[in-house]
Amino acid sequence: TPLGPKWPEPVFGRLASPGFPGEYANDQERRWTLTAPPGYRLRLYFTHFDLELSHLCEYDFVKLSSGAKVLATLCGQESTDTERAPGKDTFYSLGSSLDITFRSDYSNEKPFTGFEAFYAAEDIDECQVAPGEAPTCDHHCHNHLGGFYCSCRAGYVLHRNKRTCSALCSGQVFTQRSGELSSPEYPRPYPKLSSCTYSISLEEGFSVILDFVESFDVETHPETLCPYDFLKIQTDREEHGPFCGKTLPHRIETKSNTVTITFVTDESGDHTGWKIHYTSTAQPCPYPMAPPNGHVSPVQAKYILKDSFSIFCETGYELLQGHLPLKSFTAVCQKDGSWDRPMPACSIVDCGPPDDLPSGRVEYITGPGVTTYKAVIQYSCEETFYTMKVNDGKYVCEADGFWTSSKGEKSLPVCEPVCGLSARTTGGRIYGGQKAKPGDFPWQVLILGGTTAAGALLYDNWVLTAAHAVYEQKHDASALDIRMGTLKRLSPHYTQAWSEAVFIHEGYTHDAGFDNDIALIKLNNKVVINSNITPICLPRKEAESFMRTDDIGTASGWGLTQRGFLARNLMYVDIPIVDHQKCTAAYEKPPYPRGSVTANMLCAGLESGGKDSCRGDSGGALVFLDSETERWFVGGIVSWGSMNCGEAGQYGVYTKVINYIPWIENIISDF
């Protein structure tokens, strides 16, 4: 019997009946054995077939068999009810070998030409299975030339049998106080050949409770206890199970904080598995009773290990632990059934003693020393010398622990000095230079720093003076010795002030006339206002009406007197304002350069002379009484004049302050 080609030779070829294409002889038997490589099969088809037809092909036939299985017995030319001819059919081996047998009997009624067939090896697609057959692979099947391989979905691993997918279902640890776990793919059938381990691990003090829910279906056996697939539950105390079958197991109260669940499956079966809902319990803590003026959140029927509650106080109350204030309070239930922190108190908010008000005082309205929530206090400024700025002074203790004004401000009110107060009443007549009395010129400032000069207090920390008086100290403000509250130039009983900064008008040019002869000194501390130290007012817009020609102004200072010495006591003189053109004309003639008197100056004095300010008075204020407000304001600053003070036909020249209000206000607001 001729053998077909053997692998690894190319597996393809032609088979034909003996004598083909001529007729075949009687009593012939031919056998071909074709072998393909592993993973391949053989395909065979006929291009010519002409054999004697007989009942069940008993006489002449071609038989195709693969292993022990006969694939076909063929005869005739066309198929009948009981006989089969190949026609256009293609035949496939079941494995990698195909046997072809040709036989003719002892006679033929007429000549038959036999057959011609072609064969070839082709890849078997192992992944294609007939309906009703078990799939080649559990999950994914991949065909390739000469074979196939299986792979698994995420979460599975290929079993060593290379076909089954075992679940990667070990090492899951559940740490929440409750949860659910189930067999892989639940409620779909669980995977084969798998070993699953689940751990529930709660903090010490908790006890795990297991409830089987929904359905339970694990492969079982009528006689042997769970021989195929099983579920076991292990704690540090005992083991529960194995469980299998279709009945939901009862609740398991483990009395343990750690549980290990093991689920093992074999290679067969089609069951949906199981689902467990677990909860936990612990020793409850005492029910928290909220402190007065507080409430507990969240409200629960009971509180066990790890449960917590917070205390929130009503508006106007704050949390206190002992004497210490708390931003928040949360207590946690411990494993021994006690809370980790003692209950705090909700204590009424205490704003504490109110801050002292500089130049003012505070009065308790609600009650003496009462500083708790909703308590009211009233600030007021020291009468006569101070007034409260844009505030009614009423403050309430609010829930945030701050004293708060009716406008919602938490800062203190401001006591502003009252300006322009004087003990002096002005008369209509002009008197000669006179000694000032206490309280007459409480704004008067003595400036020592190389020379003797003067200034006027503005607010409680500024001094208005002449630029020429402090020009030398503009870069060394600390060199200025500033004294106030005294009438005597040489008295040790003065209030000392020190300069923080000197601001000279940018339009002033030293030794080139006296235009813009104005400067401000910022004091490094506020001075205390009293009857001897009071600021002068700045002129209102309407002030010009009190500074017309012949209106009386008052100049004061310790400058040179008629005797040619600096005055020991503060002196003052009442002098009328001089017509501007008249004054300009007075200083047009030599030795004065043209244009000495500018629009930024005003002049005052007597045509006959004798009443004037002099050297040492520089920077002092020429003041006027505002009859509407009954307050004194600064109209001029002692600036310059004739070489001989009080000379007839010459006048004292003063910086016109009203022209500089924006400059003054800008400096003070900026610094």
């Epitope: 010795d481 040489l490 008295s491 040790p492 009983h493 020190w498 020991r568």
Partner: antibody, heavy 121, light 106 residues
């Protein structure tokens, strides 16, 4: 030269009073403030008060307000301090001192010789 | 009132040695003044306005400081410098003195 002359000692009975003098020479008396300072045995210096001789303007340390009275006699260029209701606590050396007028006016450039007051029965 | 605390209360120094006496004020002062007093004599002005030397005072004496901390320094101690030294202020009413530092010759 500038001098402030004081009597060396005064012995007085408890409850009585004493008037201490300080005679100035060598300068214009009315141009300088006159101060008085107490020094008790083994203790520091305490300022009592001062007076302007030109117009008798006076300032006292509150501690001595009811104890001391300051006056001047311009004609004799003498300053006085009257101490009343004396007790052993008032036993001390009492100095007059001239106030400086060149700078801050708040210190003493010339000191008197001091009078030792002993209050004893 | 402003309290002036002098330190040390008592000290001794050898001739030629540098000596420093400090005066601490309970609140800031503008100027400090220093006086020397020898037994049986009246006080004598040494330093005015913190650092200025009074007339007739040897240049080995100097003053320095500001605010609440001031000091008197003798650059080289001499036998005639053995005395009690007082600091004084009048930035705040009433005028006050320190309790004194007794300097002895070693």
């Amino acid at each position: 030269q500038v001098q402030l002359q004081q009597p060396g000692a005064e012995l007085v009975r408890p409850g009585s009073s004493v008037k201490l003098s300080c005679k100035a020479s060598g300068y214009t008396f009315t141009n300088y403030w006159m101060h008085w300072v107490r020094q008790r045995p083994i203790q520091g210096l305490e300022w009592i008060g001062d007076i302007d001789p030109s117009d008798s303007e006076i300032y006292y340390n509150q501690k001595f307000k009811d104890k001391a009275t300051l006056t001047v006699d311009k004609s004799s260029s003498t300053a006085y301090m009257h101490l009343s209701s004396l007790t052993s606590e008032d036993s001390a050396v009492y100095y007059c001192a001239r106030g400086d007028i060149t700078t801050t006016l708040r210190y003493f450039d010339v000191w008197g010789t001091g009078t030792t007051v002993t209050v004893s029965s | 009132q402003i309290v002036l605390t002098q330190s040390p209360v008592i000290m001794s120094a050898s001739p030629g040695e540098k000596v420093t006496i400090t005066c601490s004020a309970s609140s800031s002062v503008s100027y400090m003044y220093w006086y020397q007093q020898k037994p049986g004599s009246s006080p004598r002005l040494l330093i005015y306005d913190t650092s200025n030397l009074a007339s007739g005072v040897p240049v080995r004496f100097s003053g320095s400081g500001s605010g609440t901390s001031n000091s008197l320094t003798i650059s080289r101690m001499e036998a005639e410098d053995a005395a009690t030294y007082y600091c004084q202020q009048w930035s705040s009413y009433p005028l006050t003195f320190g309790a004194g530092t007794k300097l002895e010759l070693k």
